[in-house]
């Protein structure tokens, strides 16, 4: 069967006026997963995103991540989109005072 991913969105300061937002998916099976950033509901191009490889996490499941750099103050325009085993979900960027956003999908 399939194990749905835990999705976690974090933010970190990148440079003056910019932040890096990272979307991590973990503990999922099988390994095929779509993870991509959107701005105003539209997919970002590949060349504006960075992906980690899909790697085994030691528990028979997998983990991966995708990151992009955005302007501070525009966080609400960006969402991380996930598709896995026929299910999908969308995850917002947390506000500045909250650095973690977890979701487990069934």
């Amino acid at each position: 069967g399939s194990v749905p991913p835990m999705v976690n969105v974090t933010r970190s300061e990148a440079s003056e006026g910019n932040i890096t937002v990272t979307c991590r998916a973990s503990s999922f099976y099988p390994r095929n997963i779509t993870l991509t950033w959107r701005q105003d509901g539209v997919s970002l191009s590949h060349d504006t995103q960075q992906w980690g490889d899909v790697l085994p996490d030691g528990n028979g499941t997998y983990q991966t991540w995708v990151a992009t750099r955005i302007c501070q103050g525009e966080e609400q325009r960006f969402t991380c989109y996930m598709e896995h085993s026929g299910n999908h979900s969308t995850h917002p960027v947390p506000s500045g005072n909250s650095h973690h956003h977890h979701h487990h999908h069934h």
Partner: antibody
């Protein structure tokens, strides 16, 4: 077995609209994207747009004002609608499943295509 | 949009030949490149993805290489069923764009 099959009107009059249906089997539209690509006679391929598992759409900006892509998950169908057709919209229209895995994004299974001729 | 150029629109080769098809992008596409095969009757098939990866079921005589703006598809030992048109496609930037195609024929 993953399959996609396009069905369209064949002939469309200039300035009219085009509706094509892509019926899929072997996978769920809920969790995978479908793309539309066309090919004018004797020419290359042109990406029109796509619809994701959650129903979000991305379009080729050159055609965005005339295009609409939607779907019905329960009927396993994806719909392409294009308005204000002109003779240079004459083409074979394909739907193709999109596989988007990290750095990899490709159209792994294609329908046979449906030919649309714009003529009065 | 990124322009994809396949300078050779058609080529003739003998069965068993090694055939190389070139594709160039108008800017660096960071290996975000796929190749498709279109048979004369119109059927389209994924041949290579992410520059050099072979999908299951594609014969090992097909290979892809390249980086930056220049990419190529090689058929190491041309077979009769390889008679088709071949298209490169970038997905570095939206919209994805295709080359004009290279038609491979038998001498």
């Amino acid at each position: 077995q993953v399959q996609l099959k396009e069905s369209g009107p064949g002939l469309v009059a200039p300035s009219q609209s085009l509706s094509i249906t892509c019926t899929v089997s072997g996978f769920s539209l809920n969790g995978q994207g479908v793309n539309w690509v066309r090919q004018p006679p004797g020419k290359g391929l042109e990406w029109l747009g796509m619809i994701w598992g959650d129903g979000s759409t991305d379009y080729n900006s050159a055609l965005k004002s005339r295009l609409s892509i939607s779907k019905d998950n329960s009927r396993s169908q994806v719909f392409l609608k294009m308005n204000s057709l002109q003779t240079d919209d004459t083409a074979r229209y394909y739907c193709a499943r999109g596989a988007h895995y990290g750095k990899r994004w490709y159209f792994d299974v294609w329908g046979a295509g449906t030919t649309v001729t714009v003529s009065s | 949009d990124i322009q994809m150029t396949q300078t050779t629109s058609s080529l003739s080769a003998s069965l068993g030949d090694r055939v190389t098809i070139s594709c160039s992008a108008s800017q660096n596409i960071n290996n975000y490149l796929n190749w498709y095969q279109q048979k004369p009757h119109g059927t389209v098939k994924l041949l290579i993805y992410y520059t050099s990866s072979l999908p299951s079921g594609v014969p090992s005589r097909f290979s892809g290489s390249g980086s930056g703006t220049d990419y190529s598809l090689t058929i190491s030992n041309l077979e009769p069923e390889d008679i088709a048109s071949y298209y490169c496609q970038q997905y570095s930037k939206l919209p994805p764009t295709f080359g004009g195609g290279t038609k491979v024929e038998i001498k």
